[in-house]
């Protein structure tokens, strides 16, 4: 079903350039390039350049799209859960009863049984069953750090609710730390948010597994619904493959620009507005690295006799199990531009203009 | 350059199903389906089902991929900036000098001049130039709410640094609120994080535009580098188009399953593991809505005579200005499965298995 053709790289580039001509005008909702008859002589006003640079700073600080997923993310993750240490454990006695906090401890040997190596952990969530809540409550999650010190992790604004609801906190980094360290018991603290002004905040929210008095050792645990860690990890027996030569490459500028990859990859393309598009109306920048995606993504017949060899190719060539996989942009970045409308200079941000990496999809 | 063929829908489905067969085995790193000789009789253990359900809950709560961008995100955003009201303004006198906070006020008439309608605002960032910092500092950002009350917005852990650095806080929602309300001056407060235990926290970080004493009215403003709001918005004159009939549809299950769209769209495909793949080894679920993407994404020649009509098509058919646009998945969701390895039931999460929407890329 695949008809092989020799790729005319120059034609592809020409088509990409022409598409960009339309794309930019379309994003600006212009039917044609704006007239330059009102543009005053000389450089852009300082304030406009400062604004353009602020926008460029923003772009430099963050990609519009998430980074390409690491290879490990393609493979299945085994899911396990580790329940909170029951509250009659002596560890809870070390933490004074408080109106603003509850404590949750976990046995790291159970965690290590589920995830033998920190690198195998893909995601860890702390799950708490929140019972009904009468008022809005701002809560903070802390991790036990050393002896009696606590490190802030995250916060959540809980809306009032008549029905129980599971809360989930991403604690992947913390659990990865715990797996690397030698401790036997590690824990979290859920506290009311206290600002520097008002410090008499009480934790109003009831978490299943703790009495309202909040003394852990008096708690009634409702079945399996006490706090737990939901873990997603690559099984140990599957992990060795990740280091093998067949791992999935990021088809990004770092790899593709320095390789002779024939298959799907990001290809270099610099657009000079004046030379390539015949445009002088964009004052800044003078051009940009648009790049483009090109190269085959072979469809893999999974009924092939060399089954195990074939399966290893899925990750790279057809991870989405498409009927006709296609080489398309993965990570994209925006482009700020400065141009004049009449006498007025405008700074505009065009989304998804720069191709940083590609993928078979 | 495009060779039109009649699409054999059944062949496409068959190829998608076969690709899924390989994909699942590949994700599990299995060369063939696991033997079922050791599977005990009866239903799955309750703990395994609870774990499977926890994983499904997670899936329900969040998509693996971000939601498709709204149509407005395709179009260029005008960038403007509004500087903080100078600190000799009387508004600063109303807020007592404090060691744990600094205050930043903005003139809403300036905001409204930049963004006449709240709906036009795409993004707002509060930018602060942080001067060198000797110690790690945990800071919180608050918005002025009513009279003297403050609403928590976000927090940041600032690492020690010898050089100045811009900090950026996403305050889109807040600025949108301000644009909707009648107030003249609105503000933010940057405070040290105070936990309920230790309350003697001082704001150690110096923000350009405030003296170390932190009394706004004594502040020396260094040029344009005092705190400002960076705004990205759809210009008013461009906004009317967004309501027009030519707007970009989300090519998701809601639209595609109920339309006769010939172009790129998500197509319905339910995979029954037993009937379609001849598999009985996956205990849960019995099947899933895999779906797939299909339909042309015409390349648009921007040099076409009907220029303004052509440009309106970019958004839908070739938003990424590709030389050969392709119909590919946009939003994907994971699939948790339960299967046995020997006598042991396993819950595994397979990433990017369910196609929720498509796009031309």
């Amino acid at each position: 079903l695949s008809t092989c053709k020799t790729i005319d790289m120059e034609l592809v580039k020409r088509k990409r350039i022409e598409a960009i001509r339309g794309q930019i005008l379309s994003k600006l909702r212009l039917a044609s390039p704006p007239s330059q008859g009102e543009v005053p002589p000389g450089p852009l006003p300082e304030a406009v350049l400062a604004l353009y640079n602020s926008t460029r700073d923003r772009v430099a600080g963050e990609s519009a799209e998430p980074e390409p997923e690491p290879e490990a993310d393609y493979y299945a993750k085994e899911v396990t859960r580790v329940l909170m240490v029951e509250t009659h454990n002596e560890i809870y006695d070390k933490f004074k009863q408080s109106t603003h906090s509850i404590y949750m401890f976990f046995n790291t040997s159970e965690l290590r049984e589920a995830v033998p190596e920190p690198v195998l952990l893909s995601r860890a969530e702390l799950r708490l069953l929140r019972l009904k809540l009468k008022v809005e409550q701002h809560v903070e999650l802390y991790q036990k750090y050393s002896n009696n010190s606590w490190r802030y992790l995250s916060n959540r604004l809980l809306a009032p609710s008549d029905s129980p609801e599971w809360l989930s906190f991403d604690v992947t980094g913390v659990v990865r730390q715990w797996l690397s360290r030698g401790g036997e018991i590690e824990g979290f603290r859920l506290s009311a948010h206290c600002s520097c002004d008002s410090r008499d905040n009480t934790l109003q929210v009831d978490i299943n597994g703790f009495t309202t008095g909040r003394r852990g050792d008096l708690a009634t645990i409702h079945g399996m619904n006490r706090p737990f860690l939901l873990l997603m990890a690559t099984p140990l027996e599957r992990a060795q493959h990740l280091q093998s030569s067949r791992h999935r490459r990021a088809l990004d500028t770092n790899y593709c620009f320095s390789s002779t990859e024939k298959n799907c990859c990001v290809r270099q393309l610099y657009i000079d507005f004046r030379k390539d598009l015949g445009w002088k109306w964009i004052h800044e920048p003078k051009g940009y690295h648009a790049n483009f995606c090109l190269g085959p993504c072979p469809y893999i017949w999974s009924l092939d006799t060399q089954y195990s060899k074939v399966l290893a190719l899925y990750n790279q060539h057809n991870p989405g199990a498409s009927a006709a996989p296609c080489c398309v942009p993965q990570a994209l970045e925006p482009l700020p531009i400065v141009y004049y409308v009449g006498r007025k200079p405008k700074v505009e941000q065009l989304s998804n203009m720069i191709v940083r990496s590609c993928k078979c999809s | 350059l495009s060779t039109c063929k009649t699409i054999d829908m059944e062949l496409v489905k068959r190829k998608r199903i076969e690709a899924i067969r390989g994909q699942i085995l590949s994700k599990l790193r299995l060369a063939s389906p696991p033997s079922q000789g050791e599977v005990p009789p009866g239903p799955l253990p309750e703990a395994v089902l609870a774990l499977y359900n926890s994983t499904r809950d997670r899936v329900a709560g969040e998509s693996a991929e971000p939601e498709p961008e709204p149509e407005a995100d395709y179009y260029a955003k005008e960038v403007t900036r509004v500087l903080m009201v100078e600190t000799h303004n009387e508004i600063y006198d109303k807020f007592k000098q404090s060691t744990h906070s600094i205050y930043m006020f903005f003139n809403t008439s300036e905001l409204r001049e930049a963004v006449p309608e709240p709906v036009l605002l795409s993004r707002a960032e509060l930018r602060l130039l942080r001067l060198k910092l000797k110690v790690e500092q945990h800071v919180e950002l608050y918005q002025k709410y009513s009279n003297n009350s403050w609403r928590y917005l976000s927090n940041r852990l600032l690492a020690p640094s010898d050089s100045p650095e811009w900090l950026s806080f996403d305050v889109t929602g807040v600025v949108r609120q301000w644009l909707s309300r009648g107030g003249e001056i609105e503000g933010f407060r940057l405070s040290a994080h105070c936990s309920c235990d230790s309350r003697d926290n001082t704001l150690q970080v110096d923000i350009n535009g405030f003296t170390t004493g932190r009394r706004g009215d004594l502040a020396t403003i260094h040029g344009m580098n005092r705190p400002f709001l960076l705004l990205m918005a759809t210009p008013l004159e461009r906004a009317q188009h967004l309501q027009s009939s030519r707007h970009r549809r989300a090519l998701d299950t809601n639209y595609c399953f109920s339309s006769t769209e010939k172009n790129c769209c998500v197509r319905q495909l339910y995979i029954d593991f037993r009937k379609d793949l001849g598999w009985k080894w996956i205990h849960e679920p019995k099947g899933y809505h895999a779906n797939f993407c299909l339909g042309p994404c015409p390349y648009i020649w921007s040099l076409d005579t009907q220029y303004s009509k052509v440009l309106a098509l970019y958004n839908q058919h070739n938003p990424g200005a590709s030389a050969a646009p392709c119909c590919v998945p946009q939003a994907l969701e994971p699939l948790p499965i339960v299967y046995y390895v020997g006598r042991k039931p396993k819950v595994e999460q397979l990433s990017n298995m369910i196609v929720r929407s498509c796009k031309c890329s």
Epitope: S35, Q36, G37, V39, P40, P41, G42, W281, R343 | -
Partner: antibody, heavy 121, light 107 residues
């Protein structure tokens, strides 16, 4: 054909007035800023005045400010220079030039052949 | 006002020579500098804009360079038709100003 054609030059006494015209053809006149540049006999080029595409903005050299007025009629594709209080030092060939103002570079990419203005008693 | 000083004011060269003309501004103008060629009895003709951009239709032996206040027009291999007067012009701010010109003559 893209071209500019000046007219209206001639001999005038000091203190007198003259109106120069420049007829444009072959391009979208209103999309361009336009300018007048002069060259005294045996001397170099001197910029005189410029006007934006809509006529909303005008610019003058200090030596002519208050005496000369630049204007345009986009419906007639014509540029004008009204010269009052003429002085002997205004004697020059006056060139009409199209301004490419893209990027703020303001260069003269199309020139007329010029019209000679002589101020003498 | 920004003063533009060209040097030399005149120079003699032969066909095939490499010739360099310089232009100095009294203040920073980069890259708002344009170059023109004028032959006797004719209107000037644009060669280079934005300090280094070659106007379409101009032979590639002409090139412009420089930044800040100092700029150069180079003719890599003089042709008979290149003997003319050359002017630089700044468009950094109004009033727009020209250099005094450089007359290029046959040796």
């Amino acid at each position: 054909e893209v071209q500019l054609l000046e007219s209206g030059g001639g001999l005038v006494q000091p203190g007198g007035s003259l109106r120069l015209s420049c007829a444009a053809s072959g391009f979208t006149f209103s999309s361009y800023a336009m300018s007048w540049v002069r060259q005294a006999p045996g001397k170099g080029l001197e910029w005189v005045s410029a006007i934006s595409g809509s006529g909303g903005s005008t610019y003058y050299a200090d030596s002519v400010k208050g005496r000369f007025t630049i204007s345009r009629d986009n419906s007639k594709n014509t540029l004008y220079l009204q010269m009052n209080s003429l002085r002997a030092e205004d004697t020059a060939v006056y060139y009409c030039a199209r301004v490419d103002s893209s990027g703020g570079y303001w260069y003269f990419d199309l020139w007329g052949r010029g019209t000679l203005v002589t101020v003498s008693s | 006002d920004i003063q533009m000083t060209q040097s030399p004011s005149s120079l003699s060269a032969s066909v095939g020579d490499r010739v360099t003309i310089t232009c100095r501004a009294s203040q920073f103008i980069s890259p708002y500098l344009n170059w023109y060629q004028q032959k006797p009895g004719k209107a000037p003709k644009l060669l280079i804009y934005a300090a280094s951009e070659l106007e379409s239709g101009v032979p590639s032996r002409f090139s412009g360079s420089g930044s800040g206040t100092d700029f150069t027009l180079t003719i890599s291999s003089l042709q008979p038709e290149d003997f003319a007067t050359y002017y630089c012009q700044q468009s950094y701010s109004t009033p727009l100003t020209f250099g005094g010109g450089t007359k290029l003559e046959i040796k």
